[in-house]
Structures are given as C-alpha cells and as structure tokens.
Interface confidence: low
Amino acid sequence: HNTTVFQGVEGQSLQVSCPYDSMKHWGRRKAWCRQLGEKGPCQRVVSTHNLWLLSFLRRRNGSTAITDDTLGGTLTITLRNLQPHDAGFYQCQSLHGSEADTLRKVLVEVLADPLDHRDAGDLWVPGESESFEDAHVEH
C-alpha cells in the first residue's frame, strides 16, 4: 500500500476518505487506527457501528468521527479541531473476525494556522474551495 497524504490546518477539521471495493468488503465493519512506529501495531481509534447495516451512522471517539457509505464504498473519517499531535501515520481498515485488511495507509500532516503568521502571503482569504488534498498531494 502506498501512503496517501492528507493535510489539514491546526484547529480546523480534516476529512480523510478511504475508497474501497464495496462488493469485496460487503458486510464488513471498518476501523480507523493509528500506526505506532514504523513496525509497531496499529492502535484502534474508532470503528463503525456494531451493526453493519447501520454503518452510515456517525460514530465518534473524542475528536475523531467515522462513517461508512457501504454502497458507494467510501469510508470517511473526520478529525475535528486538528492539533499538531494528530500528525502521523494511520490506516483505514476492513474488519473480518479478528483480522483486519488495510484499505488505505494515510499520513496526516498538520499545517500551522495561517492566521498565526503575519507575512503578507498568509493573510489572504481563499479564492476557491478546494480540499487540502488538492494542491500538494493529489494521488
């Protein structure tokens, strides 16, 4: 798996999307976990509803929320009030029994709040509404 980079601004929300094959992963719950070190385990942060049919319902653990579009095949994780300590490697997982398949490896990068920095280039209002993925990390 290649790592996909998602960027968010400190204090704001970041949405991470993990596309998957909806047929292959039919009936499976999903999870979002944080990679502990390069070779370490992936520590569960939040998982979708215990009843797969209710996967569309948003589940939350602290500032992290998860919801699954099982028909469209897209798992969405929202990190609210993004902080520097949220930066790091994560995984979207598909669960079956005690096993977990990696759907996507994710690197979350936290950019400093631009309004904290007073150089001319930092204070301009956005000209268009692209996601943080658009500029630097298309894939």
Epitope: N2, T3, L107, P114, H117, A120, G121, W124, A135
Partner: antibody, heavy 123, light 112 residues
C-alpha cells in the same frame, strides 16, 4: 547538513531510456517530498514530478505522464528519475530538489537542490 | 496549468542600485488554506538554483536582507535594495499552490 548528490552525465540515443539517481543525506529522507526539475539549454526550469519516499506516492506533470517514472529506495536514501523514449528535446540538466516543509507554516518550496545531471540525447 | 510570466526578461543595474523583478500568475496562487505558495529562486551561472524567498515574503536562511518579496493573488515582486556583484544570475518565480508546479521564464540580472 542536507546534501543531494546526483549521478553523472549521460549520453543517450533517441528512443533510449535514462535513469538518474539522487542520494540524500542530512535529513529524514522518507518524510520529505523529492522533486525532479529539468532545464533545457537556455530554457526555464520545468517541473517533472515528485515522490513521497515514505509511501511511494508520486505526481507527474502531464507533459511527462507515461514517459517518466520516479521511484525511491528509502534504505539507500536515494531517489530515481527514469525517462523513456528519449528525444533530442529531452537534452537538459536534470535536478532533484527537496521540498521544504518547515513547521510551522509549511512552505512547499524547494530548499535544497542536487548539482544537476546533464543528459544529452543525440544520434 | 498555472502559467508564470516574469518581467523584464533581463535587467542591467549599477552596483548599489535597486532592482525590481515582477511575476504574474495566470490564476490566483491563494490556496484554500489561505497560504500563497509563491517562491523566488536565484541561479548563478553554472550553478543549481537556490531558494531565496518562500511564500511570497519569507527570506530563506542565509539570504541577505537586501532581498525582499511582496505581492498577493496573481501579482508578485522581488526587490534587491542594493545590488552587489554576487547577485548576477537568473531569477525565477515559481508556484507550488497547484500541481504541476510551474516556473517563470526567468529574469537575467546583469551589472551595468
């Protein structure tokens, strides 16, 4: 200190391929984007593409799509740029350049450049 | 792709005089995160490019304070307050707001 050392000059025939290497030292290679930029004689700098060595993610300029492959070997802290189906217009100096990501502020500018590799395409 | 256009193409300035280079982009360089990723590079004869200014107006480490950058949106300026002999070379503006990254055609600075 950060250093990017590129492989030596190459002379290739039209239709051939070339692979240029860029060995990085002095920083965490796997967590910084590496860019490839070229400069044909008397021309402006031209961005070819980039790689995120830690995951292998790549982006290429449309002009080079399908003809260029950028790879990285994290164990050797080395990035590679391979260009195929060479033509005379590909004669240029090819540079690797690290993308500066300074917290706070994430500048996304190329702060360190290799010395350049001259690739000459001639029959 | 974002097209970057510099003016003038070349510039001859006396030592100690001020040099001004302009750069215009074909679309706004303001990213949705409110940052403007416009940078300036200097390339001396026979050398690799070097970063001078990043994000419009921030001097890279080791760059003398006679170099300054300004601008917003689509129009940007690099100023050298007192040109020295070592400043001879080609100056490029570049954007990294959108992939593919693009460069201006360059402005050649010479000493009168």
């Amino acid at each position: 200190q950060v250093q990017l050392v590129q492989s030596g000059a190459e002379v290739k025939k039209p239709g051939a391929s070339v692979k240029v290497s860029c060995k990085a030292s002095g920083y965490a290679f796997s967590s910084q984007w590496m860019n490839w930029v070229r400069q044909a004689p008397g021309q402006r700098l031209e961005w070819i593409g980039r790689i995120y060595p830690g995951g292998g993610d790549t982006n290429y300029a449309g002009k080079f799509q399908g003809r260029v492959t950028i790879t990285a070997d994290t164990s050797a802290s080395t990035a590679y740029m391979e260009l195929s189906s060479l033509r005379s217009e590909d004669t240029a100096v090819y540079y690797c350049a690290r993308l500066l990501r300074n917290q706070p502020g994430e500048s996304y500018a190329m702060d360190y450049w290799g010395q350049g590799t001259l690739v000459t395409v001639s029959s | 792709d974002v097209v970057m256009t510099q003016s003038p193409d070349s510039l001859a300035v006396s030592l100690g005089e001020r040099a001004t280079i302009n750069c215009r982009s074909s679309q706004s360089l303001v990213h949705s995160n409110r940052y403007t990723y416009l940078h300036w590079y200097q390339q001396k004869p026979g050398q690799s490019p070097k970063l001078l200014i990043y994000k419009v107006s921030n001097r890279f480490s080791g760059v003398p304070d006679r170099f300054s950058g300004s601008g917003s949106g689509t129009d940007f300026t690099l100023k050298i307050s007192r040109v020295e002999a070592e400043d001879v070379g080609v100056y490029y503006c570049s954007q990294s707001t959108r992939v593919p990254y693009t460069f201006g055609q360059g402005t050649k600075l010479e000493i009168k």
